[in-house]
């Protein structure tokens, strides 16, 4: 004979557990139905009546099958430096994601609580470590023989051009200036960028001491409220 299908609520066999989407109610000592995502338990089960579920109210949610007496509150609205990548519905919490050009300074289980603008390295400093989702850019002073003349979240220090005859020697924030005769090695105009988030160009290669011969026209997107153009002392 096939086993009888028990309908909730029912008393489980000793040593057995309730089925999927059921829970054991300690008070009723019965297996009872859980409420579906988007609902909560309005009335708990008894020995003779099953769980009564009700829809979550506006701005509240339940993501899982549950028997909670109240739905969870959705997180606060996203700030201007964030994007709502997942809306608050009866079945899911709101998720806020930092806009391009920002990183997550204070994470939540899902999304970000607090965003901060990516640091921009000032002239004389280059990017030592690029920014990520949850970490800021790290700047470093340009070593002798290299320079950066930009305020940027992506530019690394690049070598001075080598001149046959130097008109003005280069320093950390300026390239060498050659006399009218061609330099031995002509450096490309524009900045060298890390193959990194936050650059608007996407075909970057790993940075090398030598820039490519093609000029770069990368720029940092002014996403949302513009991050302050912070100088950095490389800390």
């Amino acid at each position: 004979l096939p086993a009888q299908v028990a309908f909730t609520p029912y008393a489980p066999e000793p040593g057995s557990t309730c089925r999927l989407r059921e829970y054991y109610d300690q008070t009723a000592q019965m297996c009872c139905s859980k409420c579906s995502p988007g609902q909560h338990a309005k009335v708990f089960c008894t020995k003779t009546s099953d769980t009564v579920c009700d829809s979550c109210e506006d701005s509240t949610y339940t993501q899982l099958w549950n028997w909670v007496p109240e739905c969870l509150s959705c997180g606060s609205r996203c700030s201007s430096d964030q994007v709502e990548t997942q809306a608050c519905t009866r079945e899911q919490n709101r998720i806020c994601t930092c806009r391009p050009g920002w990183y997550c300074a204070l994470s939540k289980q899902e999304g970000c609580r607090l965003c901060a603008p990516l640091r921009k390295c000032r002239p004389g400093f280059g990017v030592a470590r690029p920014g990520t989702e949850t970490s800021d850019v790290v700047c470093k002073p340009c070593a002798p023989g290299t320079f950066s003349n930009t305020t940027s979240s992506t530019d690394i220090c690049r070598p001075h051009q080598i001149c046959n005859v130097v008109a003005i020697p280069g320093n950390a924030s300026m390239d060498a200036v050659c006399t009218s005769t061609s330099p031995t090695r002509s450096m490309a105009p524009g900045a060298v960028h890390l193959p990194q988030p936050v650059s608007t160009r996407s075909q970057h290669t790993q940075p090398t001491p030598e820039p490519s011969t093609a000029p770069s026209t990368s720029f940092l997107l002014p996403m949302g409220p513009s991050p302050p153009a912070e100088g950095s002392t490389g800390d």
Epitope: Q92, C98, G131, P197
Partner: nanobody, 118 residues
Framework: EVQLVESGGGLVQAGGSLRLSCAAS????????MGWFRQAPGKDSEFVAA????????NYADSVKGRFTISRDNAKNTGYLEMNSLKVEDTAVYYC???????????WGQGTQVTVSS
């Protein structure tokens, strides 16, 4: 690292349609959430649409709801923005962006120009 390249922009008359593509390389695109942003001359960038990295759910700016559709093809490592009933005010450079875990859009492309004429 993820590199993103947008395409499909162009000049279209009001009421027309365009389909933007965002080709990703360098990492498994399916692991990333994807969003589209746009920036009109002299204006701050504006969020357009997003697709969740874990459950594929989508979210749209009010200004494009019902007209734009975001989607992705993980096999082709490409995301899309289908734009219908275009309006003059949709004119902007459109950027796709990627987020590894939904905390920040830490990668984006160079953008593609969309111009809607009356």
């Amino acid at each position: 690292e993820v590199q993103l390249v947008e395409s499909g922009g162009g000049l279209v008359q009001a009421g027309g349609s365009l389909r933007l593509s965002c080709a990703a390389s360098g990492r498994t695109f399916s692991d990333y959430g994807m969003g589209w942003f746009r920036q009109a001359p002299g204006k701050d960038s504006e969020f357009v649409a997003a697709i969740n990295w874990s459950n594929g759910r989508t979210n749209y700016a009010d200004s494009v709801k019902g007209r734009f559709t975001i989607s992705r093809d993980n096999a082709k490592n490409t995301g899309y923005l289908e734009m219908n009933s275009l309006k003059v005010e949709d004119t902007a450079v459109y950027y796709c962006a990627a987020t590894p875990s939904g905390k920040a859009y830490s990668y984006w492309g160079q953008g593609t120009q969309v111009t809607v004429s009356s």
